[in-house]
Interface confidence: medium
């Protein structure tokens, strides 16, 4: 349907407060180095502008495309050439050029410091004084530092956020309370951006039908009683709105998300019984909740696999009739029937089955030739499953930090040209993957642990994207979305590696080490253990360890020493020295 | 009782045109995801495309990929097919079916509609 004004149908759609959230979203992801207060003006203004449109929808330039009204929004702040250098030269495009060339822009790592919360009673004076501001500073400080953040779900963030200091200001103890709830959220936004940048990495780098595949095998798991074409329907309209939110167009994500709700409500008897409750939830909270939703039973008189895709006589007529909607069948029948293997995993097998019926259907005798395609999948299976189990015994013996910290070794040996502090974030995410998934039982381990470094791996493609320096790195990176994890656990020590040379400001340590939180502290530790490395990559594990119990007692002992600095200065060199002379 | 019952075959030039049509009676069409299928003479069954229940998505065989559009009007329980730039191979006896509750199959169909193409 065609519409007179487009920003009118998405202000009149949205509501005025989800539509100026969004705006402040969309300007804060394009312009990440602008301060706060020059995006709540852009926003107010392009929201003034909607809300005229909305009474006027044949009012001067309401007919314009939301592109060309929000990029020449953006192309009227003074700064730009200062601040952002060649993506001033984007106002010179028109459009459909002049967003690509936005987006082109995204930092994904802008650099800016982790945010640190003020003190409760300064917080909680800053909420009650002004609601507003305090969440649109919230989707500000969120949506810079994640440029490719979700943008329906952070508004839903930002609510869960509104409540915790709405419950949270009023209690007596309001840090004990803020505390813990504030680090839960904080966790949960950090996954959901992680996730997004997978989906958008997928449609941007593999196109929609990666992440077409990617979808029917998830919601096939999730929703087994749901037919194929209803899989392919919520499929191909989840595609539509993660391929707007992508390319920055939040608004129309935002509408069409909402849609896509109200479609699976009202078709919850053909989809899955475990919709109810999240139904009767206003727009926000319903999104998420059918996001999140549990899988539903397997019905329970599911067939045999073979007898449709191995045993049938018209299986290759079938597939080279329509490879695509056969493939898709394959997949979305599978996934159902496993909903304990990762998505990954799911398409691995379909990529097999495929190149299997493409050389057994050119043959004299297909069936023959595929009669044991089925068997033929043991090995794709087995290999993610003994990874997690192997992986799982050693986080059970180390612990988060420990199991960090090999995994550290690990990819420091696979790809010393990385950066460090690259080296140092990735690793510790997929350590966290222990935490996450190894306590879960056994039906689910794979599924979580595959899908969960799927998209922590893909935080290393994006940022080695931006400054490529290994060739192994970039071929794992690029040849294959779903052997990526595979091709990464295989890779070897590079034996090509130059070590770096020894650079003793590298391994100086002072006394504000003492007063960092525990997990800057093992940032620093873990650093230092990547810089080792890249020095010394032919190091032993016994030697790694050594080094760095001698390096976890010499921070002890200079942060409980009288004076510390001193004790830094004086013990730091020599710790060098019989780091250097133990790595020989 | 499912009933389906197709209409608007006949025959026509390689190059033209035909709008096939199919009345649905007996079950609830708006939840029904349904296909065309066809079968070629001394041919087995060849589905030709799908659409679901609300429209979008619609898929197509490859052999009738830009040529075929399915639609459906839900208001008037009516499933359509519209064939153009039709070629010899595409002559056959044309049904439209209910798509089932799982696999790439068909459980009703009707008694068809002969589409022949020929000069």
């Known amino acids: 349907e065609a519409y007179k004004s487009e920003i009118a149908h998405r202000y009149n759609d949205l509501g005025e407060e989800h539509f100026r959230g969004l705006v402040l979203v969309a300007f804060s992801q394009y312009l990440q180095q602008c301060p706060f207060e020059d995006h709540v003006k852009l926003a107010k203004e392009v929201t003034e502008f909607a809300k005229a449109c909305a009474a006027e929808e044949s009012g001067a330039n309401c007919d314009k495309s939301l592109h060309t009204l929000f990029g020449d929004k953006l192309c009227t702040v003074a700064s730009l050439r200062d601040k952002y250098g060649d993506m001033a030269d984007c106002c010179e495009k028109q459009e459909p050029d002049r967003n690509e060339c936005f987006l082109a822009h995204k930092d994904d790592n802008p650099g800016f410091p982790p945010l640190v919360a003020p003190e409760p009673d300064a917080l909680c004076a800053a909420f009650q004084d002004n609601e507003q501001l305090f969440l649109g500073k919230y989707l500000y400080e969120i949506a810079r530092r994640h440029p490719y953040f979700y943008a329906p779900e952070l508004l839903y963030y930002a609510q869960q956020y509104k409540g915790v200091f709405a419950e949270c200001c009023q209690a007596a103890d309001k840090a004990a309370c803020l505390g813990p709830k504030i680090e839960a959220l904080r966790e949960k936004v950090l996954l959901s951006s992680a996730k997004e940048r997978f989906k958008c990495a997928s449609l941007q780098k593999f196109g929609d039908r990666a992440f077409k595949a990617w979808s029917v095998a998830r919601l096939s798991q999730r929703f087994p009683k749901a037919d194929f074409a209803e899989i392919s329907k919520v499929v191909t309209d989840l595609t539509k709105v993660h391929k707007e939110c992508c390319h920055g167009d939040l608004l129309e994500c935002a509408d069409d998300r909402a849609d896509l709700a109200k479609y699976m409500c009202e078709n919850q008897d053909s989809i899955s019984t475990k919709l109810k409750e999240c139904c009767d939830k206003p727009v926000l909270e319903k999104s998420q909740c059918l996001a999140e939703v549990e899988r539903d039973e397997l019905p329970g008189d599911l067939p045999s696999l073979a007898a449709d895709f191995v045993e049938d006589k018209e299986v290759c007529k079938n597939y080279q009739e329509a490879k695509d909607v056969f493939l898709g069948t394959f997949l979305y029948e599978y996934a159902r029937r496993h909903p304990e293997y990762s998505v990954s995993l799911l398409l691995r097998l379909a990529k097999e089955y495929e190149a299997t019926l493409e050389k057994c259907c050119a043959t004299d005798d297909p069936p023959t030739c595929y009669a044991k395609v089925l068997d033929e999948f043991k090995p794709l299976v087995d290999e993610p499953q003994n990874l997690v189990k192997t992986n799982c015994e050693l986080f059970e013996k180390l612990g988060e930090y420990g199991f960090q910290n090999a995994l550290l070794v690990r990819y420091t040996k696979k790809a010393p040209q990385v950066s460090t502090p690259t080296l140092v974030e990735v690793s510790r995410k997929l350590g966290k993957v222990g935490t996450k998934c190894c306590k879960k039982p056994e039906s689910e381990r794979m599924s979580c642990a595959e899908d969960f470094l799927s998209v922590v791996l893909n935080r290393l493609c994006v940022l080695h994207e931006k400054t490529p320096v290994s060739e192994r790195v970039t071929k794992c990176c690029s040849e294959s979305l779903v052997n990526r994890r595979p091709c990464f656990s295989g890779l070897e020590v590079d034996e090509t590696y130059v070590p770096k040379e020894f650079n003793a400001e590298t391994f100086t340590f002072h006394a504000d080490l003492c007063t960092l939180p525990e997990a800057e502290k093992q940032v620093k530790k873990q650093t230092a253990l990547v810089e080792l490395l890249k020095h010394k990559p032919k190091a032993t594990d016994e030697q790694l360890k050594t080094v760095m119990g001698d390096f976890g007692a010499f921070v002890e002992k200079c942060c409980a020493a009288e004076n510390k600095e001193g004790c830094f200065s004086e013990e730091g060199p020599k710790l060098v020295a019989a780091a250097q002379a133990a790595l020989v | 009782e499912v009933q389906l019952l197709e209409s608007g075959g006949g025959l026509v030039q390689p190059g033209g045109s035909l709008r096939l049509s199919c009345a649905a009676s007996?079950?609830?069409?708006?939840?029904?995801?349904m296909l065309w299928v066809r079968q070629a003479p001394g041919k087995g069954l060849e589905w030709v495309s799908v659409?679901?229940?609300?429209?979008?998505?619609?898929y197509y065989a490859d052999s009738v990929k830009g040529r075929f559009t399915i639609s459906r009007d839900n208001s008037k329980n009516t499933l359509y097919l519209q064939m153009n730039s039709l070629r010899a191979e595409d002559t056959a006896v044309y049904y439209c079916a209910k798509f089932p509750s799982s696999r790439m199959k068909f459980d009703y169909w009707g008694q068809g509609t002969l589409v022949t193409v020929s000069s």
């Open positions: 007996g079950f609830t069409f708006d939840t029904s995801s």
């Open positions: 659409i679901h229940q609300s429209g979008t998505p619609t």
